[in-house]
Structures are given as structure tokens and as C-alpha cells.
């Protein structure tokens, strides 16, 4: 029993400083050091091939595929891609070890695909699989997964038609409702795509790849749990499979169960039913009801029967396009500094939605809730009690939605002066909005309580900052007050707040703040 | 040279939150087919998987461990970061990071490269 | 979770010995899972990958079989490195599960 050759494939990815384009297997560049691809045996497969992680490269980047190879005595090699053999020539490195490479310049779409190293030394044969693919955000998809019945066989195949090809996984939960948070110790992940076990409560398959991660959940009625207060609704657009699962518990195996669409039986070959016996001897059967390809005549209310329960029934509403149905109207909020308050939206949309909430040009996270009665909630809450304007956008490939939200913080104002040599000015951002009233110290008036009657030029919201209002107060300097101080205020119904500034100096000069409640 | 290095504090409080780091070199955790999971054995027992984090910043997480565990990545550092919250005593164990590999034919490439582990004593 | 059944727990063996190690899975893994052999003090080093396949640079008198539910690590002719502990991991559910363990102890 021979023992195989020690292989070892990276990647070695180059800076650019070269035009030329071409393969080459000794060329000198600028090289970052070498990435590991964990080359390994393919199982299961016929004659001795090696296959290393696949490699996603950007357009124009530049690139060695490279083999080093613990094997006694001379090796012979030969590349083969896309059928054209390339030449190959290797060499040995300071540890004996045998080096083959490839070097891909200037990688375009047609280097892109498998590149297959043959390499023949005095002791064995083998071969090994390169994978390289263009790393092309713009094509890149991710498509919500859907089910199709295994061939010949009572199981569930889950297919996600995305770029670059997504990992599956079917997310199953044998607990209700919270407990079956992504997360929690209840739920069971299985990294495949076809699943068998099919009774559980609550089944989900997850497709991911570098766009993240989308799920599909099998639409499930349960005889034995009680229904909900609004029927249960379910859409698909044209085209689309529909997969409806029945369930139901019973003492004994003494039960049937039907589907029907408007009081018609489903057509033989539109349903399967599976059974097995649970822990505790009870009768578990589903019914499934499924569609391959769903057509505007497949809608209606789809009533799963049983002789020992009472029936259950879904509406299926098929639709030409996605769409989010909202109310897009603007909301204004006030609240108080240290008020708890969340914005909300409440929605139906089909398909699931991705969303986001934005706030001064920052996005954050959106979290979406589905509500018993088909619709669904995004609330957000981390607004750390800033005021301004937050923008809830969402889409679903059909449809967008984009609601605006205004949060104002009651609380006094805060006064900003500065003086220029022809006028003085305040700002402030208190809510509700201040007014303003400006006053002068001399002699006369040592508290500053001699109105300036003329000159003042106010602005009331005239500056947005991320939809946050700013209220301003201008005074033009008369020859006659130059050297003065002079003090404005900006008050509102929570408080009043000064500056003092001294005309006739550059910049500003808020030599004193005061803060009259 | 594949290479994965634990790092962190050897000995900790009951209740306190446990900070470990994973440092890695010879592959790149950007790579959409390379992931870094936590595995940990308590002396003379078995061995425990912990958590794992693909390139796509996907998560998966011990049962059982679940509320306590947070992994996290830094790629532009190449490290990956595991806390645990709440130390225990029968927490007392080695604590490996490990990597995985998935190929074109299936994510076969269960922890191919292991770090040489360290030591965590939880002790008042 | 899946269970992982490993036995013999230890097995004493002379060099030279063939020796077997079981793992059972409490349900289907298909062909995923992998053999791991650690040394006291040592990280654990992967010997078979995909239930039957040999992890470059490990010795040929180390072999696995199975699918399923049951499999095997099978060394051919013990050599007195082969001593240590013997570790098997299903991945084919989360959470992924190793086994108990297999002390390889000279006899």
C-alpha cells in the first residue's frame, strides 16, 4: 500500500506593475506572500485526484496557482485547461520539494474555470483541480432558496440559483414559536440539500454565500395547534413552486387527511403524504400539497381535512409581480430627552423584504418581525435620542418602499454665537423652535436689559443638519455699537439660554454663557 | 506555512468573561471557502466544538453554549475572536482554534490545521 | 445533537498489531465525518477526512470505512508512534460532535 505524495497548493497573489498578459511559470512580479488552498484527496473519487479550495480572483488581478510536492526522484508534469495542454515546468525548491506553477496575468473571464495539474513522478500518477472564478460583485446573487420532491423518494430538495454557488443548510426546530429563534439551543442545522426527516415543526432551508444569507420556510398548517385568529396567508408569484405541508398528531394510526382547493380534491400527483409513529406511540402524518409551477388559477383557499380533526385552511394568493404594501406618509415624532420610543413600520410584502434604517447618512441594521396576521414590523429603536430625519428604505427585487421618519427632542436651546466686523450672529437648536430677542449692556444697563429694537434679521429653520432644524439670529452692527456687548437669547417653552459677544472683534466671542430657566 | 496561534489570558475568575484570539497566517480568512472554528477539551476528556465563522461573517454556535459564545472575525488582522461569558470552573480546559476548508465537491475540509491550544484555569 | 459513540474507550496493542476503532452516529451523517489522532500535550492532527480518505503526509497503514451510521479507523501494523489517543467528528450537523475517544496503550 503505497503512501501518497505530501501536496501542498497556494495561491500567490501579485501587485500589478506589468502589462503584459499571459501564462508564464516563472515571472517576476511583486508578491504578496503565498495563501494555503488545503489541497486534499477528493473523496469518493475514481483514480488519485487532489482538489484545491477554490480561488475567486478580481478582474485584472494577477496570480500563481502553485503545487509543491514531497515526492522522491524526478516528477514530470502537464497543464490542461479548457482541453489546450500548457506547458509545464517544474522545478525544485531549497527543501527538495518539487514547485509547480501557474501564473495567470491580468485575469480575465475566459482564464476563468478549472485548471488541471497532471503530475507523474518515478513512484505514482495523480491529478490536481484548480478552481478559479472572478470575483464580480455585480454579478453576484442571492436567491431565495425554494423546494422541489426528490425524485422517487419521500424527500425535499432545497435549491437556491445563486452567484457563486451558496452553501445549504436546512434549519430545523421541533419547538414553537420563540424557541425556534436562529440561535436558540432548540434549532438543529443540517448542511445539505436534500432532507428526509420531514415531521418536524418547523423546517427552514438557508442558502449563503458572500451576500449573506436568505431563507424559505415551509408553509406548514398544524391540526392539532389551535388557528390563528386571521387566516393564514401565503403568496407566491407566477411561476414559483407552492409547497403547503399538513400535519396532524393522533392516538392512533385511524386517520386520513385531504387537501382541497375551493372544496375540489387536488388532482392525483399534486400531493404526497408521509407517516411515522412518534416517541410516545402517536400517530404523526403529513399531507403535502404542492404546485411545480404556480399559475394565477392555482390561487384560492387550500383546506387540509382530517377525519379526526377539525379542518384548516390557508389562503394562497398568487401575484404577477412582488410588491410592499405600506403607508408611505412622513410621521413626525416629539419626544423627551429621556423618553423610551421606538419608530416603527408596519408591512405586507411578498417577497421577504431586505430593509435598512438610515440616520445621518449612516445605515444600521433592520430587524423585521412577522405578526400573526400576515403582516410584518420593523422597529427601530437605537436613535440614541438624536433628532433629525431617519429614512426606512425597503426592497424585494419587484418593489421599494421608502418612509420618512422626524424625530425631534424637546428640550431647551443651546446658543452658538460668533461676531464678524459688520454683524453679530446666534444659533441654536433647541425644540420647539426658539425665538429670539437680542439686548444691550452699557452703563445704562449693566444686566444687559436695553432691547436693540432694530437690526436683527432672524431665521427660523432655515439650515437642515440631517433634517435637524436650526434657528438662527442676525444683528447688523450699527457705527454706534461697536465696542459694546451685546447679548442674545433664544428661548422656548422649556427654557431660555444667552451669549454674551463683545462687536467689533473677529471671530467668536461668547465671553460669557448664561442659562436663565 | 499554515499556521493558527491562540492567544489569551491563562487563568480566569468564576463569572468573569473569558477573551480569546485566534491568529492566523498562511491562508486568508477572506477566502469564501476558509473558516475558523473553536474547539476546546477539558483535561483528560473529549473534545468540544465551540463556534465557527465563515468569510461571509456566518455564525454557528455550540448548543448548549449558545448564550455564552460570541465569535467574531478581523480579517484585515487575520484574527478571529471568541468570548465567553460567566466562566465556570468545568470551563477549565484547552482551547484550540482550528480551520476549515470547503471545495468545489462539499465543505469536507473539517479542521486540517489546528493551533497548538491554550491553557484556561477557572479559579477563584 | 448528534451522538458520537466511539469503542473500544482504550485498546492495549503490541507494535505491529492491527487494530480497529468504531464510531457509531446516533443518526445519518452520510460521509461526513473525519479521524483525528492527539499526543498528551499535543493538538489533535487529522488522519482521514470524508469517513475514507487519507490526509496527505499520514502514513497508508492508516485506513477508514463506513457511511452512515458506523465507521471505521482501521492501523494496519501498529508502529510506536501510532500511540495515542483517537478522536472521531461528524459534520454533518450543528452542532458538530466528536466522539469520546480511543486510548491506543502499549501492551
Known amino acids: 500500500n503505497q503512501d501518497l505524495p505530501v501536496i501542498k497548493c497556494v495561491l500567490i497573489n501579485h501587485k500589478n506593475n506589468d502589462s503584459s498578459v499571459g501564462k508564464s511559470s516563472s515571472y517576476p512580479m511583486v508578491s504578496e506572500s503565498p495563501e494555503d488552498l488545503g489541497c486534499a484527496l477528493r473523496p469518493q473519487s475514481a483514480g488519485t485526484v487532489y482538489e484545491a479550495a477554490t480561488v475567486e480572483v478580481d478582474v485584472s488581478a494577477s496570480i500563481t496557482l502553485q503545487v509543491l510536492v514531497d515526492t522522491p526522484g524526478n516528477i514530470s508534469c502537464l497543464w490542461v485547461f479548457k482541453h489546450s495542454s500548457l506547458n509545464c515546468q517544474p522545478h525544485f525548491d531549497v527543501q527538495n520539494r518539487g514547485v509547480v506553477s501557474m501564473v495567470i496575468l491580468k485575469m480575465t473571464e475566459t482564464q476563468a474555470g478549472e485548471y488541471l495539474l497532471f503530475i507523474q513522478s518515478e513512484a505514482t500518477n495523480y491529478t490536481i483541480l484548480f478552481t478559479v472564478s472572478i470575483r464580480n460583485t455585480l454579478l453576484f446573487t442571492l436567491r431565495r432558496p425554494y423546494f422541489r420532491k426528490m425524485e422517487n423518494q419521500d424527500a425535499l430538495v432545497c435549491i437556491s440559483e445563486s452567484v457563486p454557488e451558496p452553501i445549504v443548510e436546512w434549519v430545523l426546530c421541533d419547538s414553537q414559536g420563540e424557541s425556534c429563534k436562529e440561535e436558540s439551543p432548540a434549532v438543529v442545522k443540517k448542511e445539505e440539500k436534500v432532507l428526509h426527516e420531514l415531521f418536524g415543526t418547523d423546517i427552514r432551508c438557508c442558502a449563503r454565500n458572500e451576500l449573506g444569507r436568505e431563507c424559505t420556510r415551509l408553509f406548514t398548517i398544524d391540526l392539532n395547534q389551535t388557528p390563528q385568529t386571521t387566516l393564514p396567508q401565503l403568496f407566491l408569484k407566477v411561476g414559483e413552486p407552492l409547497w403547503i405541508r399538513c400535519k396532524a398528531v393522533h392516538v392512533n394510526h385511524g386517520f386520513g387527511l385531504t387537501w382541497e382547493l375551493e372544496n375540489k380534491a387536488l388532482e392525483e400527483g399534486s400531493y404526497f403524504e408521509m407517516s411515522t409513529y412518534s416517541t410516545n406511540r402517536t400517530m404523526i402524518r403529513i399531507l403535502f400539497a404542492f404546485v411545480s409551477s404556480v399559475a394565477r388559477n392555482d390561487t384560492g383557499y387550500y383546506t387540509c381535512s382530517s377525519s379526526k380533526h377539525p379542518s384548516q385552511s390557508a389562503l394562497v394568493t398568487i401575484v404577477e409581480k412582488g410588491f410592499i404594501n405600506a403607508t408611505n406618509s412622513s410621521e413626525d415624532y416629539e419626544i423627551d430627552q429621556y423618553e423610551e420610543f421606538c419608530f416603527s413600520v408596519r408591512f405586507k410584502a411578498y417577497p421577504q423584504i431586505r430593509c435598512t434604517w438610515t440616520f445621518s447618512r449612516k445605515s444600521f441594521p433592520c430587524e423585521q418581525k412577522g405578526l400573526d396576521d400576515g403582516y410584518s414590523v420593523s422597529k427601530f429603536c437605537n436613535h440614541k435620542h438624536q433628532p433629525g430625519e431617519y429614512i426606512f428604505h425597503a426592497e424585494n427585487g419587484d418593489a421599494q418602499f421608502t418612509k420618512m421618519f422626524t424625530l425631534n427632542i424637546r428640550r431647551k436651546p443651546q446658543v452658538l454665537a460668533e461676531a464678524s466686523a459688520s454683524q453679530a450672529s446666534c444659533s441654536s437648536d433647541g425644540y420647539p423652535l426658539p425665538s429670539w430677542t437680542w439686548k444691550k449692556c452699557s452703563d445704562k444697563s449693566p444686566n444687559c436689559t436695553e432691547d436693540i429694537p432694530e437690526g436683527v434679521w432672524n431665521r427660523k429653520a432655515n439650515r437642515k443638519v440631517f433634517g435637524q432644524w436650526v434657528s438662527s439670529s442676525t444683528l447688523n452692527m450699527s457705527e454706534a455699537m461697536k465696542g459694546f456687548l451685546v447679548k442674545c437669547c433664544a428661548y422656548n417653552s422649556l427654557g431660555t439660554s444667552c451669549e454674551t459677544i463683545l462687536l467689533n472683534s473677529p471671530g467668536p466671542f461668547p465671553f460669557i454663557q448664561d442659562s436663565i430657566s | 506555512q499554515v499556521t493558527l496561534k491562540e492567544s489569551g489570558p491563562v487563568l480566569v475568575k468564576p463569572t468573569e468573561t473569558l477573551t480569546l484570539t485566534c491568529t492566523v497566517s498562511g491562508f486568508s480568512l477572506r477566502n469564501a471557502r476558509m473558516a475558523v472554528s473553536w474547539i476546546r477539551q477539558p483535561p483528560g476528556k473529549t473534545l468540544e466544538w465551540l463556534a465557527h465563522i465563515f468569510s461571509n461573517d456566518e455564525k454557528s454556535y455550540s448548543t448548549s453554549l449558545k448564550s455564552r459564545l460570541t465569535i467574531s472575525k478581523d480579517t484585515s488582522k487575520s484574527q478571529v475572536v471568541l468570548t465567553m461569558t460567566n466562566m465556570d470552573p468545568v470551563d477549565t480546559a484547552t482551547y484550540y482554534c482550528a480551520r476549515i476548508v470547503g471545495y468545489g465537491s462539499g465543505w469536507y475540509g473539517y479542521f486540517d490545521y489546528w493551533g497548538q491550544g491554550t491553557l484556561v484555569t477557572v479559579s477563584s | 445533537d448528534i451522538q458520537m459513540t466511539q469503542s473500544p474507550s482504550s485498546v492495549s496493542a503490541s507494535v505491529g498489531d492491527r487494530v480497529t476503532i468504531t464510531c457509531r452516529a446516533s443518526?445519518?451523517?452520510?460521509?461526513?465525518l473525519a479521524w483525528y489522532q492527539q499526543k498528551p500535550g499535543k493538538a489533535p492532527k487529522r488522519l482521514i477526512y470524508?469517513?475514507?480518505s487519507l490526509q496527505s503526509g499520514v502514513p497508508s497503514r492508516f485506513s477508514g470505512s463506513g457511511s452512515g451510521t458506523e465507521f471505521t479507523l482501521t492501523i494496519s501494523s501498529l508502529q510506536p508512534e501510532d500511540f495515542a489517543t483517537y478522536y472521531c467528528?461528524?459534520?454533518?450537523?450543528?452542532?458538530?460532535?466528536f466522539g469520546g475517544g480511543t486510548k491506543v496503550e502499549i501492551k
Open positions: 470524508a469517513a475514507s
Open positions: 467528528l461528524q459534520h454533518n450537523f450543528y452542532p458538530l460532535t
Open positions: 443518526q445519518d451523517i452520510r460521509y461526513d
